[in-house]
């Protein structure tokens, strides 16, 4: 099936300039979606503290081709990878240089996806095989989430056992597009 094919085949990673050239971690079988701007799902972060806005984590942009078996996307798609351990935003940039590397005490914070989006992708296949159209989920933003030992195990499936499952959040509606717009729209990705 397509998911397995993506994990096995989609290895052509093109880091954007200014980002680290390491490949993103293996994507797990996760799923988080965005909610309507006017919809009935408010942000829901039950394990976060009031000052969670003071915590920061890194969003790495990667551009990759999506593959499904022998078929590859006509255009690369840009995705975010949530990287690093969360720390107080004011300490992250120069913390090491000052010798004040932040160590968490108490609850653990992890950098995990906050919102996802769906994107249409056209896959071109070799040997005259007909192209395929698929929709993929891509990370739209990252956040710091506080983990506690009371987390349900089902919430720790996404990124190994170190991260809680992200929630869907709100996002602004992208520009309208026709039903035919199935190729990766990198100009509006982020």
């Amino acid at each position: 099936q397509g998911w397995q094919a993506f994990k096995n085949d989609a290895t052509e990673i093109i880091p954007e300039l200014g980002e680290y050239p390491e490949p993103p971690p293996e994507l797990e079988n996760n799923k988080t979606m965005n909610r309507a701007e006017n919809g009935g799902r408010p942000p829901h972060h039950p394990f976060e503290t009031k000052d969670v806005s003071e915590y920061s984590c890194r969003e790495l942009h990667f551009t990759r081709y999506v593959t499904d078996g022998p078929c590859r996307s006509a255009k690369p798609v840009t995705e975010l990878v949530c990287s690093g351990q969360c720390g107080p935003a004011r300490l992250l940039p120069n913390a090491i240089g000052r010798g004040k590397w932040w160590r968490p005490s108490g609850p653990d914070f992890r950098c995990i996806p906050d919102r996802y989006r769906a994107q249409r992708v056209q896959l071109l296949c070799p040997g005259g095989e007909a192209p395929r159209a698929r929709k993929v989920r891509l990370v739209a933003s990252c956040k710091c989430k506080r983990l506690t030992r009371f987390h349900n195990q089902s919430e720790l499936k996404d990124f190994g056992t170190e991260a809680a499952r992200p929630q869907k959040g709100r996002k602004p509606r992208p520009r309208a597009r026709s039903a035919k717009a199935n190729q990766a729209e990198l100009e509006n990705a982020y």
Partner: antibody, heavy 121, light 109 residues
Framework: EVQLVQSGAEVKKPGASVKVSCKVS????????MHWVRQAPGKGLEWMGG????????IYAQKFQGRVTMTEDTSTDTAYMELSSLRSEDTAVYYC??????????????WGQGTLVTVSS | QAVVTQEPSLTVSPGGTVTLTCGSS?????????PYWFQQKPGQAPRTLIS???DKHSWTPARFSGSLLGGKAALTLSGAQPEDEAEYYC?????????FGGGTKLTVL
């Protein structure tokens, strides 16, 4: 594995409203894009609306706009579909359906057992 | 709103092959409509057989396949079994809004 359990059968009078619930287990509701489909007795399936992750909003079928409201209670992982100004032709089995939990976006992979709504005076 | 058309009924012999089609009032069905196919048996909820034109699911028997054929979406059943007798629905994606076809009653005789 995603499981959807819907509320029980309802009998309503014309002009009234009905609110059908769909309880999610296996995953949290926030991880799923919920859609609602109905089927009148002896008839085909009819899409009523659902969450569109491409645009980040709930889209309603033109036929039901202004009469249907789809909401969610994330604290209980329960989705709701409310249909107002009921008429006899709204008598149907109402299904909730969600996508799969994978990299590829596939809608309508998991279905509730259906809720029969009868509209009769 | 678009209208999606299917054959009202089809009959196939056990072991035989049959193709169900799905057309759109707006023109040819393409991969950009992400055609879905569902099977529904009496008293049961539908279940997905095919997504995105041709993508089978783990529970879809190998004898079912999806494709595009002459401007329509098609579901082909090769080697029909008695248990394949059911109603089959196609669904097309019109830019985030979906429309079901009227369904095809498939009889295995």
């Amino acid at each position: 594995e995603v499981q959807l359990v819907q509320s029980g059968a309802e009998v309503k009078k014309p002009g009234a409203s009905v609110k059908v619930s769909c309880k999610v287990s296996g995953y949290t509701l926030t991880e799923l894009s919920m859609h609602w489909v109905r089927q009148a007795p002896g008839k085909g399936l009819e899409w009523m609306g659902g969450f569109d992750p491409e645009h980040g909003e709930t889209i309603y079928a033109q036929k039901f706009q202004g009469r249907v409201t789809m909401t969610e209670d994330t604290s209980t992982d329960t989705a709701y579909m409310e249909l107002s100004s009921l008429r006899s032709e709204d008598t149907a089995v109402y299904y909730c359906a969600t996508d799969s939990v994978s990299f590829w976006e596939k809608f309508f992979q998991h279905w509730g057992q259906g809720t029969l709504v009868t509209v009769s005076s | 709103q678009a209208v999606v058309t299917q054959e009202p009924s089809l009959t196939v012999s056990p072991g035989g092959t049959v193709t169900l089609t799905c057309g759109s009032s707006t023109g040819s069905v393409t991969i950009d409509h992400y055609p879905y196919w569902f099977q529904q048996k009496p008293g049961q909820a539908p279940r997905t057989l095919i997504s995105d034109t041709d993508d089978k699911h783990s529970w879809t028997p190998a004898r079912f396949s999806g494709s595009l054929l002459g401007g329509k979406a098609a579901l082909t059943l090769s080697g029909a079994q008695p248990e394949d007798e059911a109603e089959y629905y196609c669904l097309l994606d019109y830019g985030g809004s979906f429309v079901f076809g009227g369904g095809t009653k498939l009889t295995v005789l």
